[in-house]
Interface confidence: medium
């Protein structure tokens, strides 16, 4: 990505996931009646134009914020508190990649307001789940659908990232 | 208690440059959002730029975009705002204002304001 | 960007009475997330602006329940049950939904 991001970066990405599904407790056919559409942005992750600094900050800011979902006193109740610490190991992990990374594309001068868009647009699309728990007052099914909802968001924003790296990967070898 | 310590106003000619500073003090400031507003001498607030805890997010409105930098010491509790290539419509009250950031819900609302620092450009 | 439209002052008011502020935008601020994101700022004479209600129809910490808030996503009125002397000031609107954040002008608080 042409900064000092490891090359495991896509690795943790796809362990987050991984984590993700072993965390679920409940059959999501048990909570059909709480599905919810949060609107996920997907114009963020779908544009072929991809700029380095827009990958890096939706990246960081989606991690930031499951961190932040996963990191309370009712997510603790929720989940299997093995399974939650190597989440938050690992999410911490990715953050700090991302922050040396993100300083070091607006140092190269890639704008920095390209960067503060997508955290806001985040930033409503997760107060949105946070408002939906609480109104289902953090039911299992309401985390299950919470679970599922930060997977399929997660995935979408893994991909862009794999995109992005086969984009350079392109541009090196011709 | 939280407070906002602001300074750095001055009178400065069309075209000079200036640097705002506002000390934190009472809370984490690493874990804030900041922004600054200023407020021009008809009473109206504009907003002037943002900056996330980290300092990795930035954003301008086009009216200082280029000419203003908003930056952060984490270490030293401090916020600034470099200004520069100043128009006399820059002539304003400036504030730092903190983010209410609290809880996980990541608002943008400002709980916490600087007592302003004045800005006069005038030649 | 978005316009916040606000009436320079309001209907001046009597201490003890109720007293409504009204503010309108140029864009829905209902997000699709179920949140409206319309604040509500108080400048007393002399002092920085402070925070009086945010997402709308929240209270923020501190602020007596005399002060309340509603709105259709457009059109918002932030409403004073019973005016107090240290009620008076000038009360601005503004929106956080998008970048550029904005604010409305302002409305001065009368008292007759």
């Known amino acids: 990505l042409g900064c000092d991001l490891p090359q495991n970066h896509g690795l943790l990405s796809r362990n987050t996931l991984v984590l993700l599904h072993q965390m679920r407790r409940i059959s999501p056919f048990l909570c059909l009646k709480d599905r919810r559409d949060f609107r996920f942005p997907q114009e963020m992750v779908k544009g072929s134009q991809l700029q380095k600094a827009h990958v890096m900050s939706v990246l960081h800011e989606m991690l930031q914020q499951i961190f932040s979902l996963f990191h309370t006193e009712r997510s603790s109740a929720a989940w299997n508190m093995t399974l939650l610490d190597q989440l938050h190991t690992g999410l911490h992990q990715q953050l700090q990649h991302l922050e040396t990374c993100l300083l070091q594309v607006v140092g190269e001068g890639e704008s920095a307001g390209a960067i503060s868009s997508p955290a806001l647009t985040l930033r409503r699309y997760f107060q949105g789940i946070r408002v939906y728990l609480k109104e289902k007052k953090y039911s299992d099914c309401a985390w299950e659908v919470v679970r599922m909802e930060i997977m399929k968001s997660l995935f979408l924003s893994t991909n862009m990232q794999e995109r992005l790296r086969s984009k350079d990967r392109d541009l090196g070898s011709s | 208690e939280v407070q906002l310590q602001q300074s750095g106003g001055d009178l400065v000619k069309p075209g000079g440059s200036l640097k705002l500073s506002c000390a934190a003090s009472?809370?984490?400031?690493?874990?804030?959002?900041m922004s600054w507003v200023r407020q021009t001498p008809d009473k109206r607030l504009d907003w002037v730029s943002i900056?996330?805890?980290?300092?990795?997010?930035?954003y301008y409105p086009d009216s200082v975009k280029g000419r203003f930098t908003i930056s952060r010491d984490n270490a030293k509790n401090t916020l600034y705002l470099q200004m520069s290539s100043l128009k006399s419509e820059d002539t304003a009250m400036y504030y730092c204002a903190r983010h209410a950031e609290g809880g996980g819900n990541y608002d943008y609302a400002m709980d916490y304001w600087g007592q302003g620092t004045s800005v006069t450009v005038s030649s | 960007d978005i316009v916040m439209t606000q009436a320079a002052f309001s209907n001046p008011v009597t201490l003890g009475t109720s007293a409504s502020i009204s503010c309108r935008s140029s864009k829905s601020l209902l997000h699709s997330n179920g949140i409206t994101y319309l604040y509500w700022y108080l400048q007393k004479p002399g002092q920085s602006p402070q925070l009086l209600i945010y997402q709308m129809s929240n209270l923020a910490s501190g602020v007596p329940d005399r002060f309340s808030s509603s709105g259709s996503g457009i059109d918002f009125t932030l409403r004073i049950s019973r005016v107090e002397a240290e009620d008076v000031g000038a009360y601005y609107c503004?929106?956080?939904?998008?970048?550029?954040?904005?604010f409305g002008s302002g409305t001065k608080l009368e008292i007759k």
């Open positions: 900056i996330t805890s980290g300092g990795s997010y930035t």
């Open positions: 503004a929106q956080n939904l998008e970048l550029p954040f904005t």
């Open positions: 009472g809370f984490t400031f690493s874990s804030y959002g």
